[in-house]
Interface confidence: low
């Protein structure tokens, strides 16, 4: 039975029964978040041979090996990956070995085996026999090999049963567990799989086969499966599907997309049954199953449910990839970013029409608007207050709008507004008036001749904060209503905030001409009632973290010396409240007598406050049967138990720890200090680990059904 489109087993180990009849999982398999240690011995799924996407295991208590669950899992195809990985084993507290002794091929993607405190038999598996490239594998934070004593079958009895290969210049036996060797095919088979009896399979087989040189006896197919046969390509009138099998037109017509919000079903294109037409193609009619090439960029109407689409990062711009008509308003707010112009052009460069308004503000990373290289029409069907359909405010490095010699842009309705663009020449704005047909629509204040193209501003008044309230991840602040001589000239307020461990920040920290700016900025509109004090709720903050905050009033009023009159506050330092700390790290326990345990740990990575105490809980566990599988009396076969670097010695260290010899002299000395390159590499490694862990948590933690 083909199961799919992806199986997620969580919370209750009895859900594993869903795998009972599966031979192929067309999609992914997640087994995760089973916090109660269970006895998995009664669960066995010998029918499962192939997973077409990836296998993810995360926090499954009590599971000691995967070999009993999936004794015949042979191929993980990796057609779709989990963060570049086809096999992820993460924080499996009780897993002692992987044990997938029939796993022969991971077709695409790498493996990530991390933070499995009890996991051994990792150095005994030669992953290069299973994957094409092992350089992207990530195997860290598992049980130190020195503590494992991994022994392949027969080595204790001096009758080794497994074959040897070389990994990292070490020639050694290869096995999955104490009693399961890693299968290797005879060199005569080349890249072909082989049977249990070492006979070569048919070239179209992948992983293994039940009979030699027979394309109907494959456990899995190298290319495609159709009607019981492994074929190099799908036969006529059938189509590739999910990267592994061939299906007919009727099958394709009756599957409906789980990911596509397109109301149509799947399409057939270039011999494949797929969710939607590929880039550069469009359906040949709304009910059609076929794709035709687009003339020029494919017309694609994109609509924003909230009417206004905010582009504040490459990620948000990505949502507009391929769009030619944008129904709604564009608010561009790009403060920083790497290679930002080409990234924005990549994702927004096809937009030809915007039906509403375009507003560009605080986009200090932008030098030009040429990334909107195909924009030819702003309809202005919806306008900002004051009837503006093109609004450009406070863009510190904006120098050019478009190349008007090669640009035709029409603004059908609405006015333009430009203010506080110190590097944008007024002549450039006047040129835009002519090209867009808006000349004569703007009134005097709409194009500010003093603060566009002129680096000259000064704040002369001080804004005073009136109240501050904090919680663990929020700050509420209010400030005095600022009253310039002419109240109508007050446009809005801008609140700047950032993390500030020390009280030494300045307004200009982190700003440069390339658009970098370390301050977060939030616009605050004027309260409708003149007597209400303006304020803001800053949310999504970190607990127990000091922030620096200041506020600017944005006004139009001019003083005698033609400088812009405005107001800003002093920098306020304010700390969020404490919260629950994250879990303590690197918990280690060791026994120093028959009645004592020494437990050590590192503080949590996010204390979220001042830690005052830890709570340690323990309970008696049944004796681990695994300990009895080795003959510990056999001399020299089990390494002496040593603690890995960074773990504890039973006796407190009272002198300098003896480590490697450094320099020319032999004898005890301290570890050499790390080079800058090593420190940088460690920093990047830690960052990469964090990014993966965030991705994992974001992917698998979902709200409980209502």
């Amino acid at each position: 039975e083909i199961c799919g489109p992806g199986i997620d087993i969580r919370n209750d180990y009895q859900q594993l029964k869903r795998l009972e009849n599966c031979t192929v999982i067309e999609g992914y398999l997640h087994i995760l978040l089973i916090s109660k240690a269970e006895d998995y011995r009664s669960y066995r799924f010998p029918k499962l041979t192939v997973i077409t996407e990836y296998l993810l295991l995360f926090r499954v208590a009590g599971l000691e090996s995967l070999g009993d669950l999936f004794p015949n899992l042979t191929v993980i195809r990796g057609w779709k990956l989990f963060y570049n990985y086809a096999l992820v084993i993460f924080e499996m507290t009780n897993l002692k070995d992987i044990g997938l002794y029939n796993l022969r091929n991971i077709t695409r993607g790498a493996i990530r085996i991390e933070k499995n405190a009890d996991l051994c038999y990792l150095s005994t598996v030669d992953w290069s026999l299973i994957l094409d490239a092992v350089s992207n594998n990530y195997i860290v934070g598992n049980k130190p090999p020195k503590e494992c004593g991994d022994l392949c079958p027969g080595t204790m009895e001096e009758k080794p049963m497994c074959e040897k290969t070389t990994i990292n210049n070490e020639y050694n036996y290869r096995c999955w567990t104490t009693n399961r060797c890693q299968k290797m095919c005879p060199s005569t088979c080349g890249k072909r799989a082989c049977t249990e009896n070492n006979e070569c399979c048919h070239p179209e087989c992948l992983g293994s086969c039940s009979a030699p040189d027979n394309d109907t006896a494959c456990v899995a197919c190298r290319h495609y499966y159709y009607a019981g046969v492994c074929v190099p390509a799908c036969p006529p009138n059938t189509y590739r599907f999910e990267g592994w099998r061939c299906v007919d037109r009727d099958f394709c017509a009756n599957i409906l997309s789980a990911e596509s919000s397109d109301s149509e079903g799947f399409v057939i294109h270039d011999g494949e049954c797929m969710q939607e037409c590929p880039s550069g193609f469009i359906r040949n009619g709304s009910q059609s199953m076929y794709c035709i090439p687009c003339e020029g960029p494919c017309p694609k109407v994109c609509e924003e449910e909230k009417k206004t689409k905010t582009i504040d990062s490459v990620t948000s711009a990505q949502m507009l990839q391929g769009c030619t008509i944008f129904k709604g308003n564009l608010l561009i707010n790009i403060r920083r970013g790497n290679n930002i112009a080409s990234e924005l052009e990549n994702f927004m460069g096809l937009i030809e029409v915007v039906t509403g308004y375009v507003k560009i503000r605080h986009s200090h990373a932008l030098v030009s608007l040429s990334f909107l290289k195909n924009l030819r029409l702003i309809l202005g069907e919806e306008q900002l207050e004051g009837n503006y359909s093109f609004y450009v405010l406070d863009n510190q490095n904006l120098q050019q709008l478009w190349d008007w010699d090669h640009r035709n842009l029409t603004i059908k309705a609405g006015k333009m507004y430009f203010a506080f663009n110190p590097k944008l020449c007024v002549s450039e704005i006047y040129r835009m008036e002519e090209v867009t047909g808006t000349k004569g629509r703007q009134s005097k204040g709409d194009i500010n001749t003093r603060n566009n193209g002129e680096r000259a501003s000064c704040e002369s008044d001080v804004l005073h904060f009136t109240s501050t309230t904090t919680s663990k991840n929020r700050i509420i602040i209010t400030w005095h209503r600022y009253r310039p001589p002419d109240y109508r000239d007050l446009i809005s307020f801008t609140v700047y905030y950032k993390e500030a461990p020390f009280k030494n920040v300045t307004e200009y920290d982190g700003q440069d001409a390339c658009g970098s700016n370390s301050w977060n900025m939030v616009d605050v509109d004027l309260p409708p009632n003149k007597d209400v004090e303006p304020g803001i709720l800053l949310h999504g903050l970190k607990p127990w973290t000091q922030y620096a905050v200041y506020v600017k009033a944005v006004t139009l009023t001019m003083v005698e010396n033609d400088h812009i009159r405005g107001a800003k506050s002093e920098i306020l330092y304010i700390r969020t409240n404490a919260s629950v700390p994250s879990i303590p790290l690197d918990v280690l326990s060791a026994s120093n007598s028959s009645s004592q345990l020494i437990v050590k740990w590192n503080p949590p990575s996010l204390p979220n406050g001042n830690l005052s105490y830890y709570i340690v809980r323990w309970q008696r566990q049944p004796q681990d049967g695994y300990l009895y599988r080795h003959n510990y009396c056999s001399k020299d076969k089990i390494p002496i138990r040593k603690y890995a670097d960074g773990t504890i010695d039973i006796e407190e260290v009272t002198e300098n720890p003896k480590t490697e010899v450094c320099g020319g002299e032999k004898g005890p000395c301290c570890a050499c200090p790390k080079t800058e390159a090593e420190k940088q590499a460690e920093k990047e490694e830690a960052e990469y680990r964090k990014v993966f862990e965030n991705f994992l948590h974001n992917s698998i933690f979902v709200p409980r059904p209502e």
Epitope: A258, S263, E305
Partner: antibody, heavy 123, light 112 residues
């Protein structure tokens, strides 16, 4: 032709149980969730629960947890709903209706409905 | 649970007229996959309900183009132009985004 044929009307006593069936034909039974919907006399419709015929996995409206139990028999392409500890509140027409299972998110809807089974609870 | 409120309860109409039925959800019914599973069903006396509109505005196959759906977030509308006798019955809106899935109370379309 795609059809969902439901079992006939049932007259049962309070406190008793009843098991009603829904026979699917004309389509791949395992490609669709089977849902059950209740309609009390003169009232609106209430979604009760659904079952994945592949795995036997179920989703229940909490209101009907303990009241209804869903099962399927793949060999006969039939879905069943057992109602227990019946009271007059359970007197209603019960419909089975299908909902695409695989790749379903763009077309999750009840496109085919059963004929309805009337359950009357009376002493 | 998401409460679906339909208005009006009863809608007297003349044949050939246009009718409009409103449905409001107590919270947004956008599914985590980005789709809004709002459907409209018509139930005629003594019959099972029949699907008219799915995902707010998509007409089910075989449904005349006199039927159209619109809306977003929490407010949705079914419009029927040029009413015919076969359109009479009870119309239900339904949300399939959040478990438990819920129907509106129904709107009875009847001749004036």
């Amino acid at each position: 032709e795609v059809q969902l044929q439901q079992s006939g009307p049932e007259l049962v006593k309070p406190g008793a149980s009843v098991k009603i069936s829904c026979k699917a034909s004309g389509y791949a039974f395992t490609d669709y969730y089977m849902n059950w919907v209740k309609q009390s006399h003169g009232k609106s419709l209430e979604w009760m629960a659904n079952i994945n015929p592949n795995t036997g996995g179920t989703n229940y409206n909490q209101k009907f947890t303990g009241k209804a139990t869903l099962t399927v028999d793949k060999s006969s392409t039939t879905a069943y709903m057992e109602l227990r500890s019946l009271t007059s509140e359970d007197s209603a027409v019960y419909y089975c209706t299908r909902w695409i299972l695989y790749y379903g998110s763009s077309k999750w809807y009840f496109d085919v409905w059963g004929t309805g089974t009337t359950v009357t609870v009376s002493s | 649970d998401v409460l679906m409120t339909q208005t009006p309860l009863s809608l007297p109409v003349s044949l050939g007229d246009q009718a409009s039925i409103s449905c409001r959800s107590s919270q947004t019914i956008v599914h985590s996959n980005g789709n809004t599973y709002l459907e409209w069903y018509l139930q005629k006396p003594g019959q099972s309900p029949k699907l008219l509109i799915y995902r707010v505005s998509y007409r089910f196959s075989g449904v005349p183009d006199r039927f159209s759906g619109s809306g977003s977030g929490t407010d949705f509308t079914l419009k029927i132009s040029r009413l015919e006798a076969e359109d009479l019955g009870i119309y239900y809106c339904f949300q399939g985004s959040h478990v438990p899935y819920t129907f509106g109370g129904g709107t009875k379309l009847e001749i004036k």
